[in-house]
Interface confidence: medium
């Protein structure tokens, strides 16, 4: 799986939408976890409702919220009030028993909001988003951002 890079501003929200094959993942809960290093374990941050039919209800852990539209095949994770320490490697996962299938790998990078500090570090946004290993880059310059990833087969 390629890693998708998302960049958000400190203090703002970042919304991630991982799409999946609704039929294949029927009945499965979804989870959002933080990976500790490239080969390290993935530490669960939040998962969808324990009752699959109620997966559309928002589940929160701290400033992270998850909800799953099981018919559309889209799980949405919102990272609210981004902090520098929220940066890292994450995964959208589909859970089946004790096993977890990775739907999408996401690298979250947190930038200082130049509006908060006029002397903040440079924010360089290329005219065309650069791409490494097929990953997409998104620049969060608004108060909210939603990014959808293509379904994984």
């Amino acid at each position: 799986l390629n890693t998708t890079v998302l960049q958000g501003m400190a203090g703002q929200s970042l919304r991630v939408s991982c799409t999946y094959d609704a039929l294949k993942h029927w009945g499965r809960r979804k989870a959002w976890c933080r990976q500790l290093g490239e080969e390290g374990p993935c530490q669960r941050v939040v998962s969808t409702h324990g009752v699959w039919l109620l997966a559309f209800l928002k589940k929160r852990n701290g400033s992270t919220v998850i909800a799953d539209d099981t018919l559309a095949g889209t799980v949405t994770i919102t990272l609210k009030n981004l902090q520098a320490g929220d940066a890292g490697l994450y995964q959208c996962q589909s859970l089946r028993g004790r096993e977890a299938e990775v739907l999408q790998k996401v690298l979250v990078e947190v930038l200082e909001d130049p509006l908060d500090d006029q002397d903040a570090g440079d924010l360089w946004v290329p005219e065309e988003s650069s791409s490494f290993e097929g990953a997409q880059v998104e620049h969060s310059t608004s108060r909210n951002q939603e990014t959808s990833f293509p379904p994984t087969s």
């Epitope: 890693t3 960049q7 400190a10 520098a84 990078e109 360089w124 290993e133």
Partner: antibody
Framework: QVQLVQSGAEVKKPGASVKVSCKAS????????ISWVRQAPGQGLEWMGW????????NYAQKLQGRVTMTTDTSTSTAYMELRSLRSDDTAVYYC???????????WGQGTLVTVSS | EIVLTQSPATLSLSPGERATLSCRAS??????LAWYQQKPGQAPRLLIY???NRATGIPARFSGSGSGTDFTLTISSLEPEDFAVYYC?????????FGGGTKVEIK
């Protein structure tokens, strides 16, 4: 295994510039940012800033703003930190550290001693 | 800028004793706090992240606690290799800041 190898020690005169390199290996360079931290002799750690190895976005410590530039060369998996208008209080060991966050730095460079002296 | 104040500056203890190091933030950093160990001539080594999680390969005698503004690093029973300088670091807000350090020395 993951390695960050920094360039060698430098002696500079006040007012000069220094450019420290940090060559990464053993991981996907563009999947991690690079932080720079310095430590004056006998002193504590000071965060200098961070650069995204993915697209070059940077965050610099305000006190160094205008004097520091961090860059990356993805073709060689190398990060650079340039500090200009050197002063004697810039004498320090300069470290690069890998991390998508600022403290999941499971890999650090060995450090580069920069001495500023007339 | 968030200021981190570590205390005590120096802790003199014997091997086998318990070490308790404090880090206080000038404003809340939630749980965005890490602890590092540094020995002379070496780069810092991550011990604890997110206030209480041990980094990979760190012995169980190291533990972190706290949230908000008050944090503690505890070494349950000091080993000879634990005598070093310890730094806390916050990543809640830019700029990232470190505490001034606590030196744990042999009594």
């Amino acid at each position: 295994q993951v390695q960050l190898v920094q360039s060698g020690a430098e002696v500079k005169k006040p007012g000069a510039s220094v450019k420290v390199s940090c060559k990464a290996s053993g991981y996907t360079f563009t999947s991690y940012g690079i932080s720079w931290v310095r430590q004056a002799p006998g002193q504590g750690l000071e965060w200098m800033g961070w650069i995204s190895a993915y697209n070059g976005n940077t965050n610099y410590a305000q006190k160094l703003q205008g004097r520091v530039t961090m860059t990356t060369d993805t073709s060689t998996s190398t990060a650079y930190m340039e500090l200009r208008s050197l002063r004697s209080d810039d004498t320090a060991v300069y470290y690069c550290a890998r991390g998508p966050s600022h403290y999941y730095d499971l890999a650090w460079g060995q450090g580069t001693l920069v001495t500023v002296s007339s | 800028e968030i200021v981190l104040t570590q205390s005590p500056a120096t802790l003199s203890l014997s091997p086998g004793e318990r070490a308790t190091l404090s880090c206080r933030a000038s404003q809340s950093v939630s749980s965005y706090l890490a602890w590092y160990q540094q020995k002379p001539g070496q780069a810092p080594r991550l011990l604890i992240y997110d206030a209480s999680n041990r980094a990979t390969g760190i012995p169980a005698r190291f533990s972190g606690s706290g949230s908000g503004t008050d944090f503690t690093l505890t070494i349950s029973s000091l080993e000879p290799e634990d005598f070093a300088v310890y730094y806390c670091q916050q990543v809640s807000n830019y700029p990232i800041t470190f505490g001034g350090g606590t030196k744990v020395e042999i009594k």
